[in-house]
Interface confidence: low
């Protein structure tokens, strides 16, 4: 029985050219996290494997940094980065938990939640 819940940063926005952290947190379960996948719609951004560490997809290597923790930092944001992002927790014995984050990248100089989530 899957008892865990995933908390995410939810719907967030940031300015074009800036950086932002995507973060999920799995709680309320004693299941062991074996791997976390970060995906943007149908594209794999990165994997954090409990034994093998981080792997960043080659096409994102210049703009994605691992961390902090199991989160992911997106850099040099463009308007094309707007969209859904998913953190997929592979756990044992529970199975798979998925969290969703919606990121909006804004052209303007004022981004909602910008002070809270954007890297200075």
């Amino acid at each position: 029985m899957m008892t865990g819940t995933i908390e995410t940063t939810g719907n967030i926005s940031a300015e074009k050219g800036g950086s932002i952290i995507l973060q999920c947190h799995l709680s309320s379960t004693t299941a062991q996290v074996t791997q976390v996948n970060w995906e943007q719609q149908d594209q794999l951004l990165a994997i954090c494997n409990a034994d093998l560490g981080w792997h960043i997809s080659p096409s994102f290597k210049d703009r994605v940094a691992p961390g902090p923790g199991l989160g992911l930092t997106l850099q040099s944001l463009t308007v094309n980065d707007t969209g859904e992002y998913f953190c997929i927790y592979h756990t044992y014995p529970d199975g798979t938990y998925t969290g969703r984050i919606f990121l909006e990248v804004l052209e303007s100089s004022v981004a909602e939640h910008g002070a809270r989530f954007q890297i200075p």
Epitope: E7, T8, T9, G10, I21, Q23, C24, H25, V33, C48, A50, G67, P68, G69, L70, G71, R116, F117, I119
Partner: nanobody
Amino acid sequence: EVQLVESGGGLVQPGGSLRLSCAASGGAFSTVAMGWFRQAPGKEREAVASIWRSGDSTYYADSVKGRFTISADNSKNTAYLQMNSLKPEDTAVYYCASSYSSSSGLGDIWGQGTLVTVSS
């Protein structure tokens, strides 16, 4: 409001050691993950090391593996970065980042940075 205060930076000779501290304060919250990033003059900010709250997941950049050690004291919401065998190329402003959980959900905060200079 959650704030991060870094300390421990300074001037050190090649081969020397420094210990950076990052203390989070400012409200009812708990850290989910904490990490260290660095930015050298004219370069992109890069992930150095990060740690999940439980301590069972850590990340190190290849350039610091075996030389830097990240740790955290959850009771104090504080992260540490022990830096040994420092090299001139480690010279940078080191930033602490924390993902935290509070009544308003998951958030991220960055410190203002502490300068580490490795030079003879």
